[in-house]
Every structure is written in structure tokens, then in C-alpha cells.
Interface confidence: low
């Protein structure tokens, strides 16, 4: 089937400047298929921006500024890109890319989608470094005792832009594991959040990590954080009466 | 012209039951297609259904359509509704497929579902202590109703922060509150939920050992964070 | 392993009804379509019937139209031919088929299914005659 | 409906030869063509999807091509399990159609 990522998952830019926001597209050849770019303003109506056809045919929607938007296709890397000039206010959205799939039913199709890049207009010059600053906590004695089960901590501070997407795996799979997230803080000028993972007490002896996206994370790769694994048998338990 | 209308901007429905979320459009096109699209916290865009102009009422699993075209009506029904259910819904039209056109997607504004926990009997928390330098983690879990305080008790706070408190899997609530202490060592955690007070304290264990699960001796307990 | 095991033929009169069944295994008929071929003896390949059983869609060859009903059961993990007014010309091994599983590219003139059909049953013999 | 029209009936060659048989659709299927090997008694192998995708395990002496509305299956050096029916099949459009088919011979 056709897949589209949107490897930015934030692009920040100050004003006046140019923003190019990637789609990548899998499963399909792009040089086969039409890519559509939508945007999602605040509080309004997700709407459509420009599509580059299979032989290259650029169409705009009709209100939209001239010169304002570019978009390309690029085949040896099965790109697209969406070029914002002279970035301003009112072009913080989240922008999609998006192609028709057919389906199953002959003949029919439906729209897929990109899982958005957000476009984020600041207007300090942060030089300092706002990728995210890991911590980690291991479980309690007395949640592994007691429960059977232990809970990991993966904190992140020091952030900026807002965006970032957490999950967890164990080590050598690549299955999604199921964690629950606080939201994101602000402290000052940058941001924190937090993200626990609690597993059963046969899994304590493996090697968990915290997979991070962030558009600051160093050389533009997930941040992985290693929680590395625990022996519960150290200590024998008397839990206090209640 | 064309247009799409979703009337609601929210609704709340408990699990288990059904709702029917509203979509009215204008077209003049004699064949298009409606589709409604689930729109994650995260923004990610997942197609749900599609129903065609021409069609009979399409259904997929949970997702059921009720297709009025005189009344150019689409109502998406979700039924047995799930927890994760709880997302913003996209109602859009499809323009037909002509060469000379942009075969686009005009979107309605969305209607955000909420889906509550199934109402089930009241769950004193766990409540846990979980430590990294000054940092303090109280981990409180499996409580029900989700009403709860979160005192991290110390005499030497830097700061803390307002505790993230997420619905788990069973319809109970987890949550977790942090801050950063000075004396992190013996900061403990106390929680007031339905009227009582829980401790930290009554789930510790008499150990000769640390406060914390031991790291297999293999394992480097310095954790860098891999770029 | 992808399976696809058709039974339910055998000689019938003309007007007669026969149901034929295609057991599925290795892949689920809720996710896939599933579709029947038949071929009179020392004749070509001739489809008949189609369905789509997550949407409810059927689509039959305008020759078993109003009396062939292609079905699925997804807790059996089974499609069926119900072939009713059977005539002499009905007469045939019949094949059920699952369409491969490579999405097509999507052509600004129009999209389609790949129904091109990787997996097979071994065929099911159907005679009509009186 | 799209009609297949395939050509030749039958055809015979030797083990070593180059086959090409071809199929013309009636109005456009895009790249909606497959082309399947059947043995008697047998039920049909998928060789060709999307009118020049060799399906997997199927050996590379077998491929496919499109021009407009013409498709070929070529044969580079025939072998003698090679020795068969081919048909041809559309699925641009219901009602799904299939080519009379090809009898490929020993000479």
C-alpha cells in the first residue's frame, strides 16, 4: 500500500525565511502518482494547497498567493517537498501531504495521508542547544515486589519547539509498546514532558528504550534511551503491614 | 459551491455505546464521495470509511454510514465505542475524478469524541516513589474515580510540576507527578483520593539494600541517551 | 501458508441448485476479496463472481447474474457460491482465488485493485446434466 | 465490457525457443493485466501482475510488457515445463475478463 512520512515532524523558522517540509513515499512509485499538500491552520478547516501530478502538472487551488508555495518532486528519492516563502504568521499550520490508494474494490480509492509536519514561526533566535535532555527512573523494589510489574520513567526537559513524539520498545523488536505520556510543559522558554512504560515482571529482564523524534535531536535521528535491564532478585521483600 | 457542515464541535459518549457524528455537504456534482478521516492527538490523518454517491450505505467494522443523498446527509456511526475511540473526526468531500481538476478534498471542521470510562467501583491507588538525582517521580496507580491529589512531601522543593493523570487500558486512571528536591532521598509521595489518604510509605519494603531495582551488574547504570 | 480448499461439486439437473464452499486458511477472508473462476472442460478460464467482505460489496459476470450468490462467512473463514437455475452451460470446474496483496500505483486517470489472483484452490467439479 | 483478444490459439516451438504471445484489450486497463501458466488438471499459476511485474519465485526467463493497449508475455528461452496454456486477464474494470488463451506445444 502507499505510505507517506513526513520525516519533519516540526519545522521552526523566523520570519520572512524559507521552510521546506519533505514527504517521502513508500510502497508506490512516485513518479506514478499525484502528491497533494493540505494544511491545517488553528481553528480552522484542513484545506488544500497544490498537487504535483504523476507528469509533473503543478496544480494550485485557486486564492492561494502566487509564489507563495513551490512544490517538486524529487523521483531518486521518492520525495516531495513543499516550499514556504517568506514565511509569516499565518502560516503556522500543520501541512500534509497526501496521495489516492486504490482499494480493494476495483476502481475505488481513498485518500491517505502523511502524519504532518508542523510549520512553527518564532521570532527569538534560539542558538543554544533545545534538543531533549533525558532522564531516566527505574522502577521501585516496591512495585516490582508487590505488583509483579515495573514502571520506567523517561523524562525529557529543555526542549523547543513543543512537538515531540515518545514511544518505547524493547531491545531487538520492533513492536510499539503500549506507554502513557503527560502533556507537554512549558518552563521558561523551552518545554519538558514525560512518558512511563509499565511492564510485567518477566520482561524487567530485558533491555527497554524510549525512542525520541524531536526536529533538534542531534544529526536529525531518533534519540534512543537505553533503560537498561533489572534483577529483581537482589532483595528479599517484607512489605510493611497496611 | 461546495461545502461540508459537522454542526457538532464536540460530543462525549461513555464506552460500549454508540454515536453518531453529523455531516451536511452542498455539491453540485452528480457522482463524488464522502470520507471520514480519524484525526489523532498527534495530528496523524487515518482513513475510516468511504461512501459513494452511487452506493449503498457503507460499513467497516465499527464504522457504519447512513447516506441521505436527497438530503445530502452522511452521519458516521461508531458503535461499541472503545477508549482510544477518543479522537477528532473529518467528514470530507471528493471532488470526482476529471482530468482538469485538482481531485482535492474539501474537510469539515471536525467533531472531537470523547469517550469516558465505563463507571465501575471505586479503586483505592498504589502509590510508588521513583528517584534520579533531585528528581523525584510519584507514580500512582489503578485508581477510580479519577478525582485525586498529589503531595510530594519535602522541606527543600526546587520545583514541581501540575501531575499528568491518563485513563489505562481497564477504565481506571493512572497518573504521575514530579519535581525536583534537594533532599530527594527522602521526599515521599502522599495521595488524597475518595475521601482517604494514601502514602507512599505503605508500600515500601524493609530492605538492607538502596531505594531502587538493581541494574543488572552487566548493564552501565550511567545511561548516555544514543544520538 | 495461504490455503484455498473448494468442495461442494458434483452432478446436478438443470434448475438444480448446488452451494460450493472455499475454505480459507493462512490469511483472513475479512481482509482480503475473494473471487470464483470456472472453466468448462477444454475451455478457457471464465470469472464469475466477486467479494469484498469487509465493505459487503459483490459483483457477479452478467452469465450467473440473479442466480449465482457469492457469500463469506469470516467466523468460518469461508466464501461460498450459491448456484441456483443451474443450466448445462453452468457446467465446469470452478476455482476460488484471492487477488495478490500489491497495491497498485495510482494513475491520475484512475485507480484499481491488483486482482491479479496469486492463490488458488485445487477445483471443484460441477456437472449439469439431466 | 473489456474484451481480451489473445494471439495466437496454439503455438509450436522447441525447448531453447523465444515465445512472445499478446493480448489486446478492447478500450484502456491502464496496467491492469496479468498473465497466468496453466497445466491440465491443474489450476492457473500467476507468472506477470501489473502488466510487467514478474511475481515472485516465477523464473526471469519469463516477462512482460505493455503499449497502450497491447500486452506481450515473452518466453526468452523456453524450457520444458514450459510447455502449457497461458491466458492473459484484465482487472481494470468489472466484470473481470481473461484471454481465450494460448496452447503453447512441443514441436
Known amino acids: 500500500a502507499g505510505h507517506l512520512e513526513q520525516p519533519q515532524i516540526s519545522s521552526t523558522k523566523t520570519l520572512s525565511k524559507t521552510a521546506r517540509l519533505e514527504c517521502v513515499v513508500s510502497g508506490i512509485t512516485i513518479s506514478a502518482t499525484s502528491v497533494y499538500w493540505y494544511r491545517e491552520r488553528p481553528g480552522e478547516v484542513i484545506q488544500f494547497l497544490v498537487s504535483i501530478s504523476y507528469d509533473g502538472t503543478v496544480r494550485k487551488e485557486s486564492g492561494i498567493p502566487s509564489g507563495k508555495f513551490e512544490v517538486d518532486r524529487i523521483p531518486e528519492t521518492s520525495t516531495s517537498t513543499l516550499t514556504i516563502h517568506n514565511v509569516e504568521k499565518q502560516d503556522i499550520a500543520t501541512y500534509y501531504c497526501a496521495l489516492w490508494e486504490a482499494q480493494q474494490e476495483l476502481g475505488k480509492k481513498i485518500k491517505v495521508f502523511g502524519p504532518g509536519t508542523k510549520l512553527i514561526i518564532t521570532d527569538k533566535q534560539l542558538d543554544a542547544d533545545v534538543s531533549p535532555k533525558p532522564t531516566i527512573f527505574l522502577p521501585s523494589i516496591a512495585e516490582t515486589k508487590l505488583q509483579k510489574a515495573g514502571t520506567y520513567l523517561c523524562l525529557l526537559e529543555k526542549f523547543f519547539p513543543d512537538v515531540i513524539k515518545i514511544h518505547w520498545e524493547e531491545k531487538k523488536s520492533n513492536t510499539i509498546l503500549g506507554s502513557q505520556e503527560g502533556n507537554t510543559m512549558k518552563t521558561n522558554d523551552t518545554y519538558m514532558k514525560f512518558s512511563w512504560l509499565t511492564v510485567p515482571e518477566k520482561s524487567l529482564d530485558k533491555e527497554h528504550r524510549c525512542i525520541v523524534r524531536h526536529e533538534n535531536n542531534k544529526n536529525g535521528v531518533d534519540q534512543e534511551i537505553i533503560f537498561p535491564p533489572i534483577k529483581t532478585d537482589v532483595i528479599t521483600m517484607d512489605p510493611k503491614d497496611n | 459551491a461546495q461545502k461540508v457542515t459537522q454542526a457538532q464541535s464536540s460530543v462525549s459518549m461513555p464506552v460500549r455505546k454508540a454515536v453518531t457524528l453529523n455531516c451536511l455537504y452542498e455539491t453540485s456534482w452528480w457522482s463524488y464521495y464522502i470520507f471520514w478521516y480519524k484525526q489523532l492527538p498527534s495530528k496523524e490523518m487515518i482513513f475510516l470509511i468511504r461512501q459513494g454517491s452511487d452506493e449503498q450505505n457503507a460499513k467497516s467494522g465499527r464504522y457504519s454510514v447512513n447516506f441521505k443523498k436527497a438530503a445530502k446527509s452522511v452521519a458516521l456511526t461508531i458503535s461499541a465505542l472503545q477508549l482510544e475511540d477518543s479522537a477528532k473526526y473529518f467528514c470530507a468531500l471528493g471532488e470526482p475524478n476529471h482530468f482538469l481538476n485538482t481531485d482535492k478534498l474539501i474537510f469539515g471542521k471536525g467533531t472531537r469524541v470523547t469517550v469516558e470510562p465505563r463507571s465501575q467501583p471505586h479503586t483505592k491507588p498504589s502509590v510508588f516513589v521513583m528517584k534520579n538525582g533531585t528528581n523525584v517521580a510519584c507514580l500512582v496507580k489503578e485508581f477510580y474515580p479519577k478525582d485525586i491529589r498529589i503531595n510530594l512531601v519535602s522541606s527543600k522543593k526546587i520545583t514541581e510540576f501540575d501531575p499528568a493523570i491518563v485513563i489505562s487500558p481497564s477504565g481506571k486512571y493512572n497518573a504521575v507527578k514530579l519535581g525536583k528536591y534537594e533532599d530527594s532521598n527522602s521526599v515521599t509521595c502522599s495521595v488524597q483520593h475518595d475521601n482517604k489518604t494514601v502514602h507512599s510509605t505503605d508500600f515500601e519494603v524493609k530492605t538492607d539494600s538502596t531505594d531502587h531495582v538493581k541494574p543488572k551488574e552487566t548493564e552501565n547504570t550511567k545511561q548516555p541517551s544514543k544520538s | 501458508e495461504v490455503q484455498l480448499v473448494e468442495s461442494g461439486g458434483g452432478l446436478v439437473q438443470p434448475g438444480g441448485s448446488l452451494r460450493l464452499s472455499c475454505a480459507a486458511s493462512g490469511f483472513t477472508v475479512s481482509s482480503s476479496s475473494i473471487h470464483w473462476v470456472r472453466q468448462a472442460p477444454g475451455k478457457g478460464l471464465e470469472w464469475v463472481a466477486s467479494i469484498y467482505s469487509s465493505s459487503g460489496y459483490t459483483y457477479y459476470a452478467d452469465s450467473v447474474k440473479g442466480r449465482f450468490t457469492i457469500s463469506a462467512d469470516t467466523s468460518k473463514n469461508t466464501a461460498y457460491l450459491q448456484m441456483n437455475s443451474l443450466r448445462a452451460e453452468d457446467t465446469a470446474v470452478y476455482y476460488c482465488?484471492?487477488?495478490?496483496?500489491?497495491?497498485?500505483?495510482?494513475?491520475?486517470?484512475?485507480?484499481?485493485?491488483?486482482?491479479?489472483?496469486?492463490?488458488w484452490g485445487q477445483g471443484t467439479l460441477v456437472t449439469v446434466s439431466s | 465490457d473489456i474484451q481480451m483478444t489473445q494471439s495466437p490459439s496454439s503455438l509450436s516451438a522447441s525447448v531453447g525457443d523465444r515465445v512472445t504471445i499478446t493480448c489486446r484489450a478492447s478500450q484502456s486497463v491502464s496496467s491492469a493485466v496479468a498473465w497466468y501458466q496453466q497445466k491440465p488438471g491443474k489450476a492457473p499459476k500467476l507468472l506477470i501482475y501489473?502488466?510487467?511485474s514478474l511475481y515472485s519465485g516465477v523464473p526471469s526467463r519469463f516477462s512482460g510488457s505493455r503499449s497502450g493497449t497491447d500486452f506481450t508475455l515473452t518466453i526468452s528461452s523456453l524450457q520444458p515445463e514450459d510447455f502449457a496454456t497461458y491466458y492473459c486477464?484484465?482487472?481494470?474494470?468489472?466484470?473481470?475478463?481473461f484471454g481465450q488463451g494460448t496452447k503453447v506445444e512441443i514441436k
Open positions: 501489473s502488466a510487467s
Open positions: 482465488a484471492r487477488p495478490y496483496y500489491w497495491y497498485p500505483y495510482y494513475y491520475w486517470s484512475g485507480g484499481w485493485e491488483y486482482a491479479a489472483f496469486d492463490y
Open positions: 486477464q484484465q482487472y481494470g474494470e468489472y466484470p473481470i475478463t
